[in-house]
């Protein structure tokens, strides 16, 4: 007789947990090797047994320690004989067991009195399955088939809900799920002014406790005194928890607080935050820059920059800005509107322009001034002649803002 | 009986292949599945393999499997196991192990009965 | 790879009871053998199919098996039981066999 895997399909169904012993009866062979297919891919399990009935006969099993609900589906064994494969008939396992939640209910943060719905939902087999609800220590609803939905008209303290999953195996619990009550955000704090300008400044701050609702905006308010009326309010998206302020009046003291909130209203604000915008930059140039020669250099000299209101503040120093054809160039300050250079290249052509500064920067700079090299070299007359021979250029040279240092020996600026 | 008889100690150097046996006797050899296990000296018990009574189906440990091969042939009743290049961390005793055992339920391949009096295997330059 | 975790040494006095444990996340799906091996020798089947007791092991041995959890235990151990005891199971997709690290036993 050839190879025979005998027996008839067969439906087992076992208790999810219990051992497992699927059996293939292989007649026409010595010793076979009996592999097990499930659901068209081979096991790979070590755990086979096998039983000798007779020299032609043999019994193998597929031992499961312990049935899963995976383990559940259809079996067959098959057998290799001189190149053909032989199959058996199949097994369709079935696992029960208490039911199996594939829904479970899920926390919420809710306002107070709002209506909410949970939902649940388990599995067999064996079907059917029935869902209980449970609100804290209370049965609340059911029981209803599977899968379910609790409707609650509202809560108005933090609650717990669970649903209970029953089937003829027993009842399984499914996770607690806690309903939360949504409440006003608390205040934002670490309110910083993180960058200042003449008419900007920039905000940031972190959020509070969000009430467990999310924060859909915060209001930065500005005053000019804190208490005093509002001179600004900005409404800004959240996150990021930052804001620009625009459009401020320079030099001023201002005040700022700020509030954020979500769906249930504004959280209080956060304490003040006093500020203060800089001053702006000096508005004019230094005027009528002109240069005397002297036998030890060059003498510049200007007209003092008046300040044009009181948002420049006192004006300081003057800053002298200068660079010649070989590249050397270099920047210094100054207290008076005269300067005397020395150390410089009377062989290049020289620029030179200034300008003033308070303790915000820099005003504009002068119109630049060039002093030719031939102008140097054809210059005659005593020390100290107030005969000028720098002559203004067009607003198109060179404007140096940076310092560079050369290898050029550095002219020196003295009062 | 049941007996399982190795071949001797080896000494090999790194690189090298080499092949040890285990030849079976007192009963049928297809009626039963070989495994070997590993254990370096001062160590513990490491599953290496298992070839299945006709040789159709291999198993290897994680470990092992790329670096031995694990054969039988039914006519001699003997199982081997071969590396193609030693390294020194092969550097161990091999048991041989005949995997099968018969109990009230049946036989069971994991029912480690009989082994082998092991192979000492030295891999050293 | 799939590894079982046993304690590396017990100390029990003569006629106390040993336990030793072993533990593997397939092990409520896989069943666990336990081995025995004395110094110089190949090693011996104790227990299969987690409580099994095998052909000719005395009955102080016993295998019991929870969860993650296989434990052999020895009830009034001897002198004799002194040995290394390896738990042996399969690895969760079922195509490799692992054997657990070793526990030493002393009976002092």
């Known amino acids: 007789a050839g190879l025979k895997l005998m027996g008839a399909p067969v439906k087992l169904t076992v208790s999810q947990g219990q051992p497992v012993k699927l059996n293939c009866s292989v007649e026409g062979m010595e010793e076979p090797d009996i592999q097990w297919v499930k659901d068209g891919a081979v096991v790979q399990n070590l755990d086979q047994l096998y039983i000798p009935v007779s020299e032609q006969h043999w019994i193998g099993f597929l031992s499961l320690k312990s049935a899963e609900r995976s383990d559940a589906g259809r079996y067959w064994c098959q057998v290799e004989d001189g190149g053909e494969t032989e199959i058996s008939q199949p097994v369709w396992l079935t696992v029960e067991g208490v039911p199996f939640f594939t829904v479970e209910p899920k926390d919420l943060a809710v306002p107070p009195n709002a209506p909410f719905q949970l939902s649940c939902e388990a599995v067999g087999p064996p079907e059917p399955v029935t869902i209980v609800w449970w609100r804290g220590t209370t049965k609340i609803g059911g029981p209803a088939p599977s899968p379910s939905v609790l409707n609650v008209t509202g809560v108005t303290q933090s609650t717990m809900f669970s649903c209970e999953a029953h089937n003829l195996k027993g009842l399984a619990s499914s996770r607690t799920a806690t309903v939360h009550l949504q409440a006003l955000p608390a205040a934002p704090f670490n309110v910083t002014v993180t960058k200042l300008s003449s008419s900007n400044a920039s905000v940031a701050w972190m959020p509070g406790a969000d009430g467990r609702a999310l924060l859909q905006s915060c209001t930065v308010q500005v005053t000019q005194a804190p208490g005093g009326w509002e001179v600004l309010a900005v409404v800004v998206p959240v996150p990021p928890f930052t804001c620009l302020l625009r459009d401020l009046v320079p030099a001023t003291n201002y005040s700022l607080r700020v509030r954020c909130a979500n769906a249930l209203g504004p959280s209080p604000y956060a304490d003040w935050v006093p500020f203060q915008t800089k001053g702006l930059a000096p508005a004019s140039a230094p005027q009528n820059l002109h240069a005397i020669r002297t036998d030890s250099g060059l003498i510049l000299e200007w007209e003092e920059v008046i300040p044009e209101g009181p948002l420049e503040g006192p004006l300081g120093p003057y800053k002298l800005s200068w660079v010649q054809d070989n590249g050397t160039q270099d920047e210094l300050t100054v207290e008076g509107t005269r300067a005397n250079l020395t150390g410089w290249d009377p062989q290049k052509d020289l620029i030179v322009r200034v300008c003033v500064s308070n303790a915000v920067g820099c005003g504009p700079w002068s119109q630049p001034l060039v002093v030719s090299s031939h102008d140097h070299a054809g210059q005659q007359g005593p020390p100290h002649s107030r005969t000028s021979w720098l002559v203004p250029r067009g607003s198109s040279a060179h404007h140096h803002h940076h310092h560079h240092h050369s290898a050029w020996s550095h002219p020196q600026f003295e009062k | 009986e049941v007996q399982l008889v190795q071949s001797g100690a080896d000494v090999k150097k790194p690189g090298a292949s080499l092949t040890i046996s285990c030849q079976a006797s007192?009963?049928?050899?297809?009626?039963?599945?070989i495994s070997w296990v590993r254990q370096k000296p001062g160590k513990g018990l490491e599953w290496m393999g298992r070839i299945s009574r006709h040789g159709s189906q291999t198993y290897y440990g994680p470990s092992f499997q790329g670096h031995v091969t694990i054969s039988a042939d039914r006519s001699t009743a003997t199982a081997y196991l071969q590396w193609r290049s030693l390294e020194a961390s092969d550097t161990a005793m091999y048991y041989c192990?005949?995997?099968?055992?018969?109990?009230?339920?049946?036989?069971?391949?994991?029912?480690?009965?009989?082994w082998g009096p092991g192979t000492l295997v030295t891999v050293s330059s | 790879s799939y590894e079982l975790t046993q304690p590396p040494s017990v100390s029990v006095s003569p006629g106390q009871t040993a336990r030793i444990t072993c533990s593997g996340d397939a092990l409520p799906k896989k069943y666990a053998y336990w081995y025995q091996q004395k110094s110089g020798q190949a090693p011996v089947l104790v227990i299969y199919?987690?409580?099994k007791r095998a052909s000719g092991i005395p009955e102080r041995f016993s295998g019991s098996s929870s969860g993650t959890m296989a434990t052999l235990t020895i009830s009034g151990a001897q002198v004799e039981d002194e040995a290394d005891y390896y738990c042996?199971?399969?690895?969760?997709?079922?195509?490799?066999?692992?054997f657990g690290g070793g526990t030493k036993l002393t009976v002092l």
């Open positions: 199919e987690d409580h």
């Open positions: 192990v005949r995997a099968g055992g018969q109990t009230s339920g049946g036989t069971i391949p994991e029912y480690y009965q009989h």
């Open positions: 007192g009963y049928t050899f297809t009626d039963y599945w």
């Open positions: 042996y199971s399969i690895s969760p997709a079922g195509n490799y066999g692992v």
